[in-house]
Interface confidence: medium
């Protein structure tokens, strides 16, 4: 006869491990008992359980409620046992010793491997600002047994580097993603991908990149000279910029207060029916937490009654 078993039994933390031990013998042979033991390099051989043909299943008190026989129907030649709710400390070598009559004893050893799936965490780096050099965008850490694989999935150009720390029963892997911040990266996803044999599918954690920037400011609205004549309605100046965080806008007049009737609505300056008093230098001030920008324009309102004058369009930043 011979024993049918496995060299390695792999189970995920918390699952039940089936330790296989089946005696394949002649029809007239009987299995008297199957003794299971944990083989520890330090503690030696320690009995786990014993299946006896007459007295039934005996379980070592250290494994009370954790060792069972597989559910029926059971073959009398099957000495397999279930180890419930596998923990990391269960990982190691096990021995199955089968006593048969009249053939004698057979034994086999197997290794139980307990996979500990990682629970990854993603930590964003310091605030990203356009103009910085190579900067940490995020780090991702995952600890498991065996060591997990940690990679990055992103369209953003950058560099990744990994380091790992080995503990007695697990390994922690940390991967960092560095980049040179630019405004085009704003809102782009940066995904940490963790692979591990104990996971049915990769674990993914996505971080949305936020890059602080403030674009140069410019003013639109002076393109059509015909709008800037005395009596015209609906004339506006619009301040153009963009930024992250979104900027705030402030309008002032360089050569005095804003004329009465001029309305400020965010980035837009709205004028009442134009008069020559609306001529002047207007300044748009754009700011966010990162920086501030100014753009100024000179507005001259043309009086049609005075053909000698024409609209002077000057823009300076």
């Amino acid at each position: 006869g011979e024993l049918e078993t496995s060299d390695v039994v792999t189970v995920v933390l918390g699952q039940d491990a089936k330790l296989p031990c089946f005696y394949r013998g002649d029809p007239d042979e009987q299995v008297g008992q199957v003794a299971w033991a944990r083989v520890d390099p330090n503690e030696g051989i320690r009995e786990l359980a014993l299946l006896h043909s007459k007295y039934g299943l005996h379980v070592n008190p250290a494994y009370e409620d954790r060792v069972e026989q597989p559910p029926p129907p059971r073959d009398p030649l099957d000495g397999s046992v279930l180890l419930r709710n596998a923990v990391q400390a269960d990982e190691g070598e096990y021995e199955c010793r089968v006593s048969t009559f009249p053939a004698g004893s057979f034994q086999a050893r197997m290794r139980l491997r307990v996979l500990v799936p990682p629970l990854p965490s993603l930590n964003p780096g310091p605030p990203l600002e356009e103009g910085q050099g190579l900067t940490l965008a995020a780090s991702c850490t995952a600890e498991g047994s065996p060591a997990p694989s940690v990679t990055w999935d992103t369209e953003v150009k950058g560099t990744q580097s990994s380091r790992s720390f080995t503990h007695p029963r697990s390994a922690a892997v940390t991967s960092e993603f560095h980049l040179v911040p630019s405004r085009s990266m704003n809102g782009q996803p940066l995904t940490c991908v963790v692979s591990h044999p104990g996971l049915l599918q990769d674990r993914r954690i996505t971080h949305t990149l936020q890059v602080a920037f403030l674009a140069e400011a410019s003013v639109r609205g002076l393109e059509d000279q015909n709008l800037w004549q005395v009596g015209r309605e609906g004339a506006t100046l619009k301040c153009l910029s963009e930024g992250q965080p979104p900027p705030k806008y402030n309008w002032t007049r360089l050569d005095g207060p804003l004329p009465s009737g001029v309305r400020v609505k965010g980035d837009t300056l709205g004028f009442p029916p134009l008069t020559t008093e609306h001529s002047g230098v207007y300044v748009c001030h754009v700011s966010n937490e990162l920086s501030s920008r100014d753009s100024q324009v000179t507005v001259e309102v043309l009086d049609p009654e005075d053909p000698g004058k024409q609209v002077d369009l000057v823009s300076a930043s």
Epitope: G32, Q33, A35, A37, R46, E47, L48, A49, L50, H52, K54, Y55, H58, V59, N60, P61, S99, F101, P102
Partner: nanobody, 118 residues
């Protein structure tokens, strides 16, 4: 040949405790399984509990949680701690041991009387 000698039986009130001992005439390391059966008057011999040389245990459902089996291989002795005794535990308690060579050989003691009064 292995001789098994039980002791510790006696009369006890319901809810009380007793500890039975069974001494073997040879090293219990070579005795694969040791344990206890009991036989009440007019009934068949009934399995109580067994323990392996490695300390693994098994109990009949009727005594699980109340009785504890243990063994001291150095002293060649097996014990049965009986707590929360009931009148229906009244019986002669027999020590048993199995020796595995070419086939299993089972040995029995002469028994010790346990009486639980209500």
């Amino acid at each position: 040949e292995v001789q098994l000698v039980e002791s510790g039986g006696g009369l006890v009130q319901a809810g009380g405790s007793l500890r039975l001992s069974c001494a073997a005439s040879r090293s219990t390391f070579s005795l694969n399984i040791m344990g206890w059966y009991r036989q009440a008057p007019g009934k068949q011999r009934e399995y109580v509990a067994t323990i392996t040389s490695g300390g693994s245990t098994n109990y009949a459902d009727s005594v699980r949680g109340r009785f504890t089996i243990s063994r001291d291989n150095a002293e060649n002795t097996v014990y049965l701690q009986m707590d929360s005794l009931k009148p229906e535990d009244t019986a002669v308690y027999y020590c048993t041991a199995e020796l595995v060579r070419r086939g299993p050989t089972t040995y029995w003691g002469r028994g010790t009387q346990v009486t639980v009064s209500s």
